[in-house]
């Protein structure tokens, strides 16, 4: 059996103010079945970042065509950077449990810190 | 080509069991969610079961008596099935199921369907 | 559960006619929504998912719509080999799937 791994490649990711930041994530399995969402920091204070199922994230759009069959690639972009917006990142799986998903497994994370402003 | 075949149909008297199976092929089973879907003689569709690796849901009409399972390796999907009754009688397809966008299942491929028919 | 009510029960329809069948849901299910066709003594065929994408294959004769509660699957110029009947299925909110009663297209 395919063990599902979540793919986060970039460990650092520095952004400038005002710019658009791109969070890659990818996985190795459909399964389990249930959504991946989008988190930053951990824990239970953590602050959802992205639900395509249900929510509104104005700043947030998916890399991949939303009507894709059989996606594998959850990567996100984030627009409009503010240093509000530093902190580690995480994609996660969640396995379809009813009536409440329950994490399955979470990516290793990518950390967002503010770069140089351009010259 | 992706093909879904069914077999393990027949007659069985209330009570009995029953084992149904889905061989599989043309796409990587594994990594894929499969499905159970019945439909009675002249009636509509009715989904069963479905599996994903290790996780297993169920209509509430066969939970309890019906059991999905998988064999990766012989790229197999199975159903058990145990204390029948008449209105289990049905078609029972296979389906390979397929996600959209983050998340959603529907079904994109269908066997042909094996025939159960539960008669004292 | 989500209950999905599929009207006209049947459809007497001529080839080369525009047919539109209609799929209501008792809940918001956003786009979650399939289409598939069924011929007698036939398994069913996927046509069209996420309310309006079609499947690999399927003629642009078929065409989905809505979001929401109220979904329509046409056919802007039924052809004879679209004789057979037509069901909608939920996949927003699940175990379980739901599918809707069908819709019967017979030859007027």
């Known amino acids: 059996e395919e063990e599902l791994q979540m793919i986060q490649p970039e460990k650092l990711l520095l952004v400038t103010v005002g710019k658009t930041a791109t969070l890659h994530c990818t996985v190795t399995s459909l399964l389990p079945v249930g959504p991946v969402l989008w988190f930053r920091g951990v824990g239970p204070g953590r602050e959802l970042i992205y639900n395509q199922k249900e929510g509104h994230f104005p700043r947030v759009t998916t890399v991949s065509d939303l009507t894709k069959r059989n996606n594998m690639d959850f990567s996100i972009r984030i627009s409009s950077i503010t240093p509000a917006d530093v902190g580690t990142y995480y994609c996660v799986k969640f396995r379809k449990g009813s009536p409440e998903n329950v994490e399955f497994k979470s990516g290793p994370g990518t950390e967002m810190a503010l770069g140089a402003k351009p010259s | 080509e992706v093909q879904l075949v069914e077999s393990g149909g027949g007659v069985v008297q209330p009570g009995g069991s029953l084992r149904l199976s889905c061989a599989a092929s043309?796409?990587?089973?594994?990594?894929?969610?499969v499905s159970w879907v019945r439909q009675a003689p002249g009636k509509g569709l009715e989904w069963v079961s479905t599996i994903g690796a290790d996780d297993t849901y169920y209509a509430d009409s066969v939970k309890g008596r019906f059991t999905i399972s998988r064999d990766n390796s012989k790229n197999t999907l199975y159903l058990q099935m145990n204390s029948l009754r008449a209105e289990d009688t049905a078609v029972y397809y296979c389906?390979?199921?397929?996600?959209?966008?983050?998340?959603?299942?529907?079904?994109?491929?269908w066997g042909q369907g094996t025939l159960v028919t539960v008669s004292s | 559960e989500i209950v999905l009510t599929q009207s006209p029960a049947t459809l007497s329809v001529s080839p080369g006619e525009r047919v539109t069948f209609s799929c209501r849901a008792s809940?918001?299910?956003?786009?979650?929504i399939a289409w598939y066709q069924q011929k007698p003594g036939q398994a069913p065929r996927l046509l069209i998912y996420?309310?309006?994408s079609r499947d690999t294959g399927i003629p642009d004769r078929f065409s989905g719509s809505g979001s929401g509660t109220d979904f329509t699957l046409t056919i802007s110029s039924l052809q004879s080999e679209d004789f057979g009947v037509y069901y909608c299925q939920q996949y927003y909110d699940w175990p379980p799937f739901t599918f809707g009663g069908g819709t019967k297209v017979e030859i007027k």
């Open positions: 389906a390979k199921d397929s996600t959209v966008g983050w998340s959603g299942d529907f079904f994109d491929y």
């Open positions: 043309g796409f990587s089973f594994s990594i894929y969610a």
């Open positions: 809940q918001n299910v956003r786009s979650d």
């Open positions: 996420a309310a309006s």
